[in-house]
């Protein structure tokens, strides 16, 4: 029997043991989060699988993920949403300490997919473990990119109160219009629900004492947000190590001075 021809993509293939990983993460999440205990993880996996299995992996739509989004519906309390751009590790370290604030990856759907890759093949029920479309070299409407665009949009749409965003001050473009934050989340914050966006610009180098809130790209972000009738605030986090330490131990005397 000749092996069936398989499309070769430029990106790495589906993460090994993808179905088992998603299912295990779902079970773990619903055990730890009482408000999600009603979720049936087999149904979640079936909806996830249904979004990309048997479909051409360069023609995935946000519509494909709607059944999954519906099953994973979750609300974040007002003032507790933390967005991030190009500084995922620190954002996650922060919400691990500040347990009442949430990044997308602290929500069920983000938690399920974080750091995973997946894709299927047209007209077969197989998962492609060999290769998946690369956003740049193959197509942008691939299963992974469309998933994150879909859940990021929903996460931003449901945010309320003061929304925070952590930005990487070590980059030459601190705010990038092409990032998920710049191209999706910023434009889906709802002015009738969101009073303000507060940016935390995280300094990378210990010798860097500049006011990065004056950076031209931050001014660009301020302009976009203000035009949407949302107030904008910005804070430099000069000492992210101290910042995290003070979140853990707010009573520490050194936390009374600036960070």
């Amino acid at each position: 029997v000749l092996p069936r021809w398989r499309q070769q993509w430029s990106g790495s293939g589906t993460t090994s043991r993808f179905p088992e990983t998603v299912l295990a993460r779902c079970v773990k999440y619903t055990e730890v989060h009482p408000e999600m205990r009603h979720v049936d993880c087999q149904s979640v996996w079936d909806a996830f699988k249904g979004a990309f299995i048997s479909k051409y992996p360069c023609n995935i739509t946000e519509e494909d993920y709607q059944p999954l989004v519906k099953l994973g519906t979750q609300t974040v309390p007002c003032n507790k949403t933390l967005l991030w751009s190009r500084i995922k590790d620190l954002a996650h370290q922060f919400t691990q300490v500040q347990r009442d604030m949430f990044t997308l990856e602290d929500m069920l759907l983000g938690y399920l997919a974080d750091d995973l890759t997946w894709c299927g093949e047209f007209n077969t029920f197989e998962i492609n473990y060999q290769s998946c479309p690369d956003w740049r070299k193959d197509c942008s409407n691939n299963p992974v990119s469309v998933f994150w665009k879909t859940v990021s949009r929903r996460f931003a749409e449901t945010a309320c109160g003061v929304v925070h965003v952590m930005l990487n001050g070590s980059r030459s473009k601190i705010f990038d219009k092409n990032s998920t934050f710049g191209s999706v989340e910023v434009h889906n914050l709802q002015p009738e629900k969101v009073q303000a966006l507060e940016a935390w610009v995280i300094h990378g180098g210990r010798e860097d004492s500049r006011d990065l809130c004056q950076d031209p790209t931050i001014k660009e972000l301020e302009s976009i947000i203000s035009k949407r009738n949302i107030r904008f605030f910005c804070k430099n986090i000069y000492r992210p190590d101290k910042f995290l330490q003070c979140v853990k131990n707010p009573e520490d005397s050194s936390c009374l001075s600036g960070i």
Epitope: R86, R171, H203, P240
Partner: antibody, heavy 123, light 110 residues
Framework: EVQLLESGGGLVQPGGSLRLSCAAS????????MSWVRQAPGKGLEWVSV????????SNADSVKGRFTISRDNSKNTLYLQMNSLRAEDTAVYYC????????????????WGQGTTVTVSS | QSVLTQPPSASGTPGQRVTISCSGS????????VYWYQQLPGTAPRLLIY???QRPSGVPDRFSGSKSGTSASLAISGLQSEDEADYYC???????????FGGGTKLTVL
């Protein structure tokens, strides 16, 4: 003076393992991200792996994911690269390199490099 | 095939000015800093330019870096025979979550 001294290279068969070490001196090791970069014979530079200053986060090139593990022992001022399931295409000079600025959380570019250690994968 | 594209070779005569280009995309050069390295034959790479256009101490001001959009350039003025080496650009890529090096440019001083 900042110094980086790699060791642990050698000849190994395909499928074998090797552990590279990089002894650092002349700077506060625990304040800097560290990287491994390799150069195959007659080829260009290829980044392999990076580890943050405190060792909390790492990132690897796709070509070595699942096979190579970067780690560090800040008490010994030493960086490591554990290389498993070695392939012929892993044959290269492996350089250890120090991150540029003292960083809190992120990876940054390499400013000082060691002289390299040679890894040959051949049967 | 490298994601950062450099010409494989460049040349010039002593005293001349040469420019080496490095082309990337909006997930690397456009959003992050570019670094340039010089590798003399048989030696380890040496940092030449950091954060697009900054020179580390000890690097002659004959070397300069610039960036515009998704491309960067290294210029060497007053070319000297000791500049004969391989030159590499490097930057971080967000999509790949990795450092990238250009394929390298071999500079020959004629």
């Amino acid at each position: 003076e900042v110094q980086l001294l790699e060791s642990g290279g050698g000849l190994v068969q395909p499928g074998g393992s090797l552990r590279l070490s990089c002894a650092a001196s002349g700077f506060t090791f625990e304040d800097y991200a560290m990287s491994w970069v390799r150069q195959a014979p007659g080829k260009g530079l290829e980044w392999v792996s990076v580890i943050s200053s405190k060792g909390g986060s790492t990132s690897n090139a796709d070509s070595v994911k699942g096979r190579f593990t970067i780690s560090r022992d800040n008490s010994k001022n030493t960086l490591y690269l554990q290389m498993n399931s070695l392939r012929a295409e892993d044959t290269a000079v492996y350089y250890c390199a120090k991150g540029m600025e003292r960083q809190y959380y992120s990876y940054n570019a390499m400013d000082v490099w060691g002289q390299g250690t040679t890894v040959t994968v051949s049967s | 095939q490298s994601v950062l594209t450099q010409p494989p070779s460049a040349s010039g005569t002593p005293g001349q000015r040469v420019t080496i280009s490095c082309s990337g995309s909006n997930s690397n050069i456009d959003v992050d800093y570019v670094y340039w390295y010089q590798q003399l034959p048989g030696t380890a790479p040496r940092l030449l330019i950091y954060k697009d256009d900054q020179r580390p101490s000890g690097v002659p001001d004959r070397f300069s870096g610039s960036k515009s959009g998704t491309s960067a350039s290294l210029a060497i003025s007053g070319l000297q025979s000791e500049d004969e080496a391989d030159y590499y650009c490097a930057t971080w890529d967000d999509n790949l979550n990795s450092w990238l090096f250009g394929g390298g440019t071999k500079l020959t001083v004629l």
